[in-house]
């Protein structure tokens, strides 16, 4: 069988290429109630069964575990710890299982876990140590290479009194455990900003998806250290312009492809550098589709077709001449 055929959805074959600890080791061919198991495909599917906790009697052979569409609510520490450990588990999909809390060490004792999908769970409480497992300043490296966290933002009334962006970033950076992470998807999370230190501490990233958020600016974000970055998805945000520093950093990444569609670009004098860059660069995919949203007179104009004469700023009037 082959690896997962899509980066963000697990196939029934081996990925890529692969609660209290149970007292009794499960029988090799045992399959938990409400689940479907295939030893040949090393796959267990417990899908849309309204499970409220992770089954304790998972077979030791499991490589791909689907626990989607359940009602798990809380993922406690050691939720997948077993005796013997689930040493082969490489792909874990928990999407759409109504998780609102993931506690410290929830994924401990999974030495081969390469892919984790927590998408479509309203994570009001994601422990800073959910992925690192400990509060040490430097934790043991996590084996994760792909982390899918699309649409994990809880409804406004369920959020803690803290920045949601900050909560997610704290979990990504704790203990520097995710140094080997290659794919990170954070789409559809209402992010208003990207904390400036997050990317610098994920040096192995090859694919970063920040699409369908509310990012207004990348001014304080540095991409300089992401020398392996191959795709950067920034579609469907609230970006108005990319400034020189960002443009230079993106241009300096050797393998990058950037996706910028459906942002409300402001085509005034501040856009001149970006337009010049767009005309010369090959890193932006579909750059001919980028259009102005503001000011009104420029709406729907194609960025690539603009020249410096088009990009003016209304003079700022001294206070005495300003009208209400």
């Amino acid at each position: 069988s082959s690896p997962t055929s899509s980066a963000s959805s697990f196939s029934s074959s081996a990925p890529f290429l692969a609660s209290a600890v149970s007292a009794q080791p499960p029988l090799p061919d045992q399959c938990p109630a409400l689940c479907e198991c295939s030893e040949a495909a090393r796959t267990v599917k417990c899908v849309n069964r309204n499970l409220t906790e992770v089954p304790t009697d998972l077979p030791a052979y499991v490589r791909n575990l689907f626990l989607t569409g359940n009602q798990l609510a809380v993922l406690p520490a050691g939720a997948f710890a077993r005796r013997p450990p689930l040493a082969e588990l490489a792909a874990l999909n928990l999407s759409g299982s109504r998780l609102d809390e993931v506690r410290a060490g929830a994924f401990e004792h999974l030495p081969s876990l390469r892919q984790l999908d927590l998408s479509h769970n309203p994570l009001a409480d994601l422990s800073p140590f959910a992925f690192s497992g400990s509060n040490a300043s430097v934790s043991a490296p996590s084996p994760l290479v792909e982390l899918i966290l699309n649409h994990i933002v809880p409804p406004e009334d369920e959020r803690q009194n803290r920045s949601f962006e900050g909560m997610v970033v704290a979990a990504l950076l704790a203990g520097r455990a995710l140094q080997g992470l290659r794919r990170l998807e954070l789409a559809s999370n209402h992010f208003l900003y990207l904390p400036r230190d997050v990317l610098a501490q994920l040096p192995s990233l090859r694919h970063l998806d920040l699409s369908n958020n509310s990012l207004v600016s990348l001014t304080y974000v540095s991409f300089r250290n992401l020398t392996h970055l191959e795709s950067l998805h920034l579609e469907d945000n609230a970006l108005k312009v990319l400034h020189n520093g960002t443009l230079a950093e993106l241009q300096g990444l050797p393998h990058i492809r950037v996706f910028l569609d459906n942002n409300p670009w402001v085509c005034d004098c501040h856009m001149a550098d970006m337009v010049t860059w767009l005309k010369e660069t090959e890193v932006v995919q579909g750059k001919d589709r980028l259009t102005c949203a503001y000011p009104e007179k420029m709406r729907n104009r194609v960025l690539l077709e603009l020249n410096s004469a088009d990009l003016d700023c209304d003079p700022i009037l001294p206070p005495s001449l300003q009208t209400s």
């Epitope: 890529f16 192995s204 492809r257």
Partner: antibody
């Protein structure tokens, strides 16, 4: 099952060009990178470059930058590699190989290889 | 480019013996190393990736270890069908590069 089937052997003269095709089946073509790796007779493996089937973006080994073009046709799930200005040292078996978007450069399935002989 | 130095280049071993091949990278490549097997007249086959992950369907007599610059590939008990050339490859940075290969034959 996954298969990568390459075009047949070619004999070319120095200075000519060769275009090798690789038809994929048994998986979603646009979910995997397609790479080209060559192996001279009795020698090791050398990565030439890759193409991203979903957008056609390429990443090429600097050694071949000026001579190689990698393309794909998603409608027929086929990748192509054209090598120009052939010289005798380009005589090799040329393989296409796929990788996931995450592993990037681990090649889990390979074509059967296409022998290109460059001789005057 | 990162240079992968593989040793030995040739190995003659008896069936049932343990086989160890090493690969040294010219700079740290984390755990981004794969091992391939190539039999005569065939394309290479992926055996190990991320230094130690066994690819689907690969017998458990094949294993890999290492991180940083030093990597080891092991066949715990050589079988006759394991006669082949084995290559290491780094996936840390582009261009990916291969070791020179280790030709394994039965004594």
């Amino acid at each position: 099952q996954v298969q990568l089937v390459q075009s047949g052997a070619e004999v070319k003269k120095p200075g000519a060009s060769v275009k090798v095709s690789c038809k994929a089946s048994g998986y979603s073509f646009t979910d995997y990178y397609m790479h080209w790796v060559r192996q001279a007779p009795g020698q090791g493996l050398e990565w030439m470059g890759r193409v991203s089937p979903n957008n056609g973006a390429t990443n090429t080994n600097q050694k071949f930058k000026d001579r190689v073009t990698m393309t794909r046709d998603t409608s027929i799930s086929t990748a192509y590699m054209e090598l120009r200005s052939l010289r005798s040292e380009d005589t090799a078996v040329y393989y296409c190989a796929r990788s996931t978007m995450i592993t990037s450069y681990y090649f889990d399935y390979w074509g059967q290889g296409t022998l290109v002989t460059v001789s005057s | 480019d990162i240079v992968m130095t593989q040793s030995p280049s040739f190995l003659s071993v008896s069936v049932g013996d343990r086989v160890t091949i090493t690969c040294k990278a010219s700079q740290s490549v984390s755990t981004d190393v794969a091992w391939y097997q190539q039999k005569p007249g065939q394309a290479p086959k992926l055996l190990i990736y991320f230094a130690s992950d066994r690819y689907t369907g690969v017998p458990d007599r094949f294993s890999g270890s290492g991180s940083g610059t030093d990597f080891t590939f092991t066949i715990s008990s050589l079988q006759a069908e394991d006669v082949a050339v084995y290559y290491c490859q780094q996936d840390y940075s582009s261009p990916p590069t291969f070791g020179g290969g280790t030709k394994l034959e039965i004594k």
